[in-house]
Interface confidence: medium
């Protein structure tokens, strides 16, 4: 029951990391225009993302465009594009691998076939948050580097937007959910074949342990 | 229609300095950076500094740094550049240009221009 | 500093030709780089923003592309009216032109 309690936390995690990485990649906050104590740096306020940038002029009006062409983008941008959607995209094949081998679904009968599905998608769901951690942590690196660099001029240095505080969350959830899915299975496959216990027999130590075994000076 | 007018020619013996003003119209004067830009009579185009109207804050060319001065005047959406220590090798013509950043390309360009100001500097 | 190398420094073309004109910056400036065109007397012109991106009301012979340190600035067929000198003018790092290519007649 534990074991199940553990997956679905897990899955719920994993969704909310997916639906946080969606907005990540859709919002036009991934770069922002600086701000050194309370005054803005720039006239022009600029909101950069990975679609489109947005400008809020000091009076106030706000423009949004997306971007003209691909091809004419430069090609961190482009990759940061690519890994995020490929990053939504295994997120959504994790999901699927979930669901068919989920203690609540019939897709597969077998214990041991559910348990391995279980842990795949559990390490697809952290190969999905590392691949969103990726562009992230890329585009947070170019910020930090450019605003400490005195060539560049005060107009372009930006600061880090709300889209990559997103994109970690994002990031931070998947591999969350994807590693507490990864560590159902050794109890989701504990009634299966002995072939299976086997393979994670080193687990099985710390699930049998009774309270005795643990030293006597941390109980009142 | 966006317009940037230049205070007139100077002739300025060596030592002096020179001010030279930029007034804008047609658009919001605190919403775009001003620059600076010189270009020597048969040479080439050489950017000296830029202001954020909002705020006053500037940014230099290394290369005048010592000598250049912008400030900006809100109330009469008038930019200024002064050159102190006048050389002969600053003979030439300054324009004010204005930034605008350009949507769906993540760049900048300076779209708008002065007519440009001679400064001539000779003893 | 940033150095920003435009070749050839003048060229010579007739009515019709097609121009091309090269600008490679010292380091990466990523797509942040304009061109402009400037006739005898007159203030700059910008054709050309964000490396490939034509300005509003300026014809479609014209054409730059490239990014990174590499960059092309393009006339597909000269007319008379474009005979003037052109700038490459990078902004990733503060603001730095090219030396100019002056297109002349033949």
């Known amino acids: 029951m534990a074991s199940a309690g553990m997956q679905i936390l897990g899955v719920v995690l994993t969704l909310l990391g997916w639906v946080n990485g969606l907005v990540s990649c859709a919002l036009p906050m991934w770069k922002v225009t600086a701000f050194i104590g309370n005054s803005i740096v720039v006239a022009q306020v600029v909101w950069e993302g990975l679609w489109m940038s947005c400008v809020v002029q000091s009076t106030g009006q706000m423009q949004c465009k997306v971007y003209d062409s691909l091809l004419a983008l430069p090609q961190d941008l482009q990759a940061a594009r690519a890994l995020c959607v490929i990053a939504l995209l295994v997120a959504l094949f994790g999901l699927l691998v979930y669901l068919a081998g989920a203690k609540c679904t019939t897709c597969v009968e077998e214990k041991d076939s559910k348990a391995r599905l279980v842990l795949t998608s559990g390490i697809v769901f952290v190969i999905s948050g590392v691949l969103t951690l990726i562009p992230v942590c890329w585009t947070a690196h170019a910020i930090i580097r450019d605003f400490y660099n005195p060539l560049v001029a005060e107009a372009q240095k930006r600061e880090l937007g709300a889209s990559l505080y997103l994109g970690w969350a994002a990031s931070g959830l998947l591999l969350l959910g994807g590693g507490l899915l990864c560590c159902t299975c050794p109890s989701g496959g504990s009634q299966g074949p002995s072939h299976y216990m086997a393979r994670y027999s080193t687990s099985a130590p710390a699930i049998s342990r009774g309270p005795s075994e643990y030293p006597t000076k941390n109980y009142v | 229609e966006v317009q940037l007018v230049q205070s007139g020619a100077e002739v300025k013996k060596p030592g002096a300095s020179v001010k030279v003003s930029c007034k804008a119209s047609?658009?919001?004067?605190?919403?775009?950076?001003m620059n600076w830009v010189r270009q020597a009579p048969g040479q080439g185009l050489e950017w000296m500094g830029e202001?954020?109207?909002?705020?006053?804050?500037?940014t230099y060319n290394q290369k005048f740094k010592a000598r250049v001065t912008i400030t900006r005047d809100t109330s009469t959406s008038t930019a200024y550049m002064e050159l102190s220590s006048l050389r002969s090798e600053d003979t030439a013509v300054y324009y004010c240009?204005?930034?605008?950043?350009?949507?769906?390309?993540?760049?900048?360009?300076?779209?708008?221009w002065g007519q440009g100001t001679l400064v001539t500097v000779s003893s | 500093d940033i150095q920003m190398t435009q070749s050839p420094s003048s060229l010579s073309a007739s009515v019709g030709d097609r121009v091309t004109i090269t600008c490679q910056a010292s380091?990466?400036?990523?797509?942040?780089l304009n061109w402009y065109q400037q006739k005898p007397g007159k203030a700059p012109k910008l054709l050309i923003y964000?490396?490939?991106k034509l300005e509003d009301g300026v014809p479609s012979r014209f054409s730059g592309s490239g990014s990174g340190t590499d960059f092309t600035f393009t006339i597909s067929s000269l007319q008379p009216e474009d005979f003037a000198t052109y700038y490459c003018?990078?902004?990733?790092?503060?603001?730095?032109f090219g030396q100019g290519t002056k297109v002349e007649i033949k």
């Open positions: 240009a204005r930034r605008d950043y350009y949507l769906g390309s993540n760049s900048y360009a300076l779209d708008y």
């Open positions: 047609g658009y919001t004067f605190t919403g775009y950076y």
């Open positions: 202001i954020n109207p909002a705020t006053g804050s500037t």
């Open positions: 380091q990466s400036v990523s797509n942040n």
């Open positions: 964000g490396a490939s």
């Open positions: 003018l990078q902004h990733r790092y503060m603001w730095t």
